[in-house]
Amino acid sequence: KLTIESTPFNVAEGKEVLLLVHNLPQHLFGYSWYKGERVDGNRQIIGYVIGTQQATPGPAYSGREIIYPNASLLIQNIIQNDTGFYTLHVIKSDLVNEEATGQFRVYPELPKPSISSNNSKPVEDKDAVAFTCEPETQDATYLWWVNNQSLPVSPRLQLSNGNRTLTLFNVTRNDTASYKCETQNPVSARRSDSVILNVLYGPDAPTISPLNTSYRSGENLNLSCHAASNPPAQYSWFVNGTFQQSTQELFIPNITVNNSGSYTCQAHNSDTGLNRTTVTTITVYAEPPKPFITSNNSNPVEDEDAVALTCEPEIQNTTYLWWVNNQSLPVSPRLQLSNDNRTLTLLSVTRNDVGPYECGIQNELSVDHSDPVILNVLYGPDDPTISPSYTYYRPGVNLSLSCHAASNPPAQYSWLIDGNIQQHTQELFISNITEKNSGLYTCQANNSASGHSRTTVKTITVSAELPKPSISSNNSKPVEDKDAVAFTCEPEAQNTTYLWWVNGQSLPVSPRLQLSNGNRTLTLFNVTRNDARAYVCGIQNSVSANRSDPVTLDVLYGPDTPIISPPDSSYLSGANLNLSCHSASNPSPQYSWRINGIPQQHTQVLFIAKITPNNNGTYACFVSNLATGRNNSIVKSITVSASGTSPGLSAGA
């Protein structure tokens, strides 16, 4: 089917368009182009007649059109009036007509836009500003850019008039930015030059610098005032209410005690008509005063609070020094000095931060020291400890237990036996105990300042007979040649002897075996697989003796270098290959095979039926122990010969 494609469809004025013909018939008498959607002789543009072999212009020919051999029509120097439909009329050799219509649209090349504003100097928090993108152009889209970004979403920004107008309500100083507008149509896009919005604001409350308010007699006083303001503020200084001068800086050389007083800076914005003032009190000392330390927290809590120690007074051009425990400050990430060294901050205080702290002011000749300050760091209570550590007592003796928990302020203690409150003392004394005094002894420590409590429970057994002991271990699965194991004989009992047996024998002499803690603890250093034995501990006193159940040490080891069996390496074709791999290991290792580097199966036995010379190669067994994290392997070469080629070959399994 004959069709027309316009390239481009949207054409800019002054540019060109090609009406491209698709599926032009083969045998032609001629073809002709017309303006509009139908064939109309009065609107013929140009035609080509095969008979004359000439192109003939028609009434609608403007001199800007070119017809091509493929019947396509080029229109140059496009004008607005060219918009619309174009019809190609094709007459075939058999005089049958065909028609096709195409169209394009013409748009102007947009001019560079500009921004007009209804208010060149809006006042912050008071005025609105309306920007309008000029000129108004038909069929154009308007866009806005702020600092080369698309418009932010804000209830104070409003687009209107087909997006041609951008209104900023209640302008703020943050609206001081570069504004651009852009016009777009299907053939062009143009951006305006930027317009900088000049928002009048302020003055804000002025700041007087430097911040220090204490000076020494004879120094120069140099105060500077600044207030955020547009246009820049005009400044005035007053001392004790009396006007001094209209400058941003106030300079008084060689000050005396008489210069002490209130210093006021007034900032004025002539455009907004607003005034703001700030007052600072200046103290001039005749002599440098003895420094003293102020703290922002007199009772800081450990691991919770920070403490800021400040050296007073603040004096200009002064060097501040600090000492802790009569030493210069240690390097610590928890110690921070301010820029002027006047403030020492202890981040997340600990009980070790109590001090004493001293600060100093350096004069020309000497250093003036403050009195020392000690921090009262509240901490604890830590877990209380009950002493002595014995848990077994004989009837008839006195039971004297003492409780202690690190705490500031000191902890208050309470004792409970089997959950029943006994007394509010640090020590618990029971004379001439009997079996009935056996039970759970709880010490509770309480810190009244922090409100925290901590408890420790101890089981006391009163018995003439020693109990059956048990063995506790610090490592249930030690790794060979790496770990140590400490066995402890429980319980701890008064006036008791502790003994040890290994595999029913008394302890062998070995540098790897060590007794400690009154023989209660047996330590094996650098365990080996040979240490995997039965360990028994015994306790005895003048009345009785008892032994624990044996504890067998489970030593993790291996895998050792594996062994592949049978050892044969030569096989006859047709035999079965049945290789078994074994490695000493605890726990048992995982096995895997590789033939010529290619992974096979994860089994201990590798079986291949009816092998051929194709099965020649290297057979590797890999072992891994997940518990020790260790691996090992071995490689075996297998040769398979054709049947009957060589004597002495294994027939296989």
Partner: antibody
Framework: QIQLVQSGPELKKPGETVKISCKAS????????MNWVNQAPGKGLKWMGW????????TYAEEFKGRFAFSLETSASTAYLQINNLKNEDTATYFC??????????WGAGTTVTVSS | DIQMTQSPASQSASLGESVTITCLAS??????LAWYQQKPGKSPQLLIY???RLADGVPSRFSGSGSGTKFSFKISSLQAEDFVSYYC?????????FGGGTKLEIK
């Protein structure tokens, strides 16, 4: 592809006749006129005329009326230029060129005719 | 007949330079003007048609301008292969006359 293939060079004596061929391929021969252009050695191009390949009607430039004749063999997509009663001044290269109303877009390689006694 | 006056007949220029050739028609021909390049021993090749339009495959350093009776042809930044002959031709009416040609020579 579209091409015009011309016959080979000719060496003739004065008074003889020469007929040059121009065979078209790659397009519909009868849709485009065929031009003939002459170029004497070291000289510029001269338009001799054209033949309407659809009707067979020739048009000659004034200078080439009389001894020069354009003809067609439409079935063979071939145009011919015949020069009768050759003169020494007919020594030139003769080009055929396909006509589109705005340009000559396809040219033959040229046939050199040398007239010498 | 429409006469086409092409100038200059020859011009010397250096590689990288620009050259302009002009063609004057003895009567108005609209924009029905073509420019051709001819290399020694070869047939002419179409460069520009309709006074300003570049033929397919022709480098953009070639350009044409003008309408009515005065036409220009420009080559910007001459390459070595551009030092050959150039012809204008009117196709407004028969006879389709050529200009006398311009031979570009390397300086």
């Amino acid at each position: 592809q579209i091409q015009l293939v011309q016959s080979g060079p000719e060496l003739k004596k004065p008074g003889e006749t020469v007929k040059i061929s121009c065979k078209a391929s790659g397009y519909t021969f009868t849709n485009y006129g065929m031009n003939w252009v002459n170029q004497a050695p070291g000289k510029g191009l001269k338009w001799m005329g054209w033949i309407n390949t659809n009707t067979g009607e020739p048009t000659y430039a004034e200078e080439f009326k009389g001894r020069f004749a354009f003809s067609l063999e439409t079935s063979a997509s071939t145009a011919y230029l015949q020069i009768n009663n050759l003169k020494n001044e007919d020594t030139a290269t003769y080009f055929c060129a396909r006509l589109w109303y705005l340009y000559f877009d396809v040219w033959g390689a040229g046939t050199t005719v040398t007239v010498s006694s | 007949d429409i006469q086409m006056t092409q100038s200059p007949a020859s011009q010397s220029a250096s590689l990288g330079e620009s050259v302009t050739i002009t063609c004057l028609a003895s009567q108005t021909i609209g924009t029905r003007l073509a420019w051709y390049q001819q290399k020694p021993g070869k047939s002419p090749q179409l460069l520009i048609y309709a006074a300003t339009r570049l033929a397919d495959g022709v480098p953009s350093r070639f350009s044409g301008s003008g309408s009515g009776t005065k036409f220009s042809f420009k080559i910007s930044s001459l390459q070595a292969e551009d030092f050959v002959s150039y012809y204008c031709q009117q196709l407004y009416s028969t006879p389709y006359t050529f200009g006398g040609g311009t031979k570009l020579e390397i300086k």
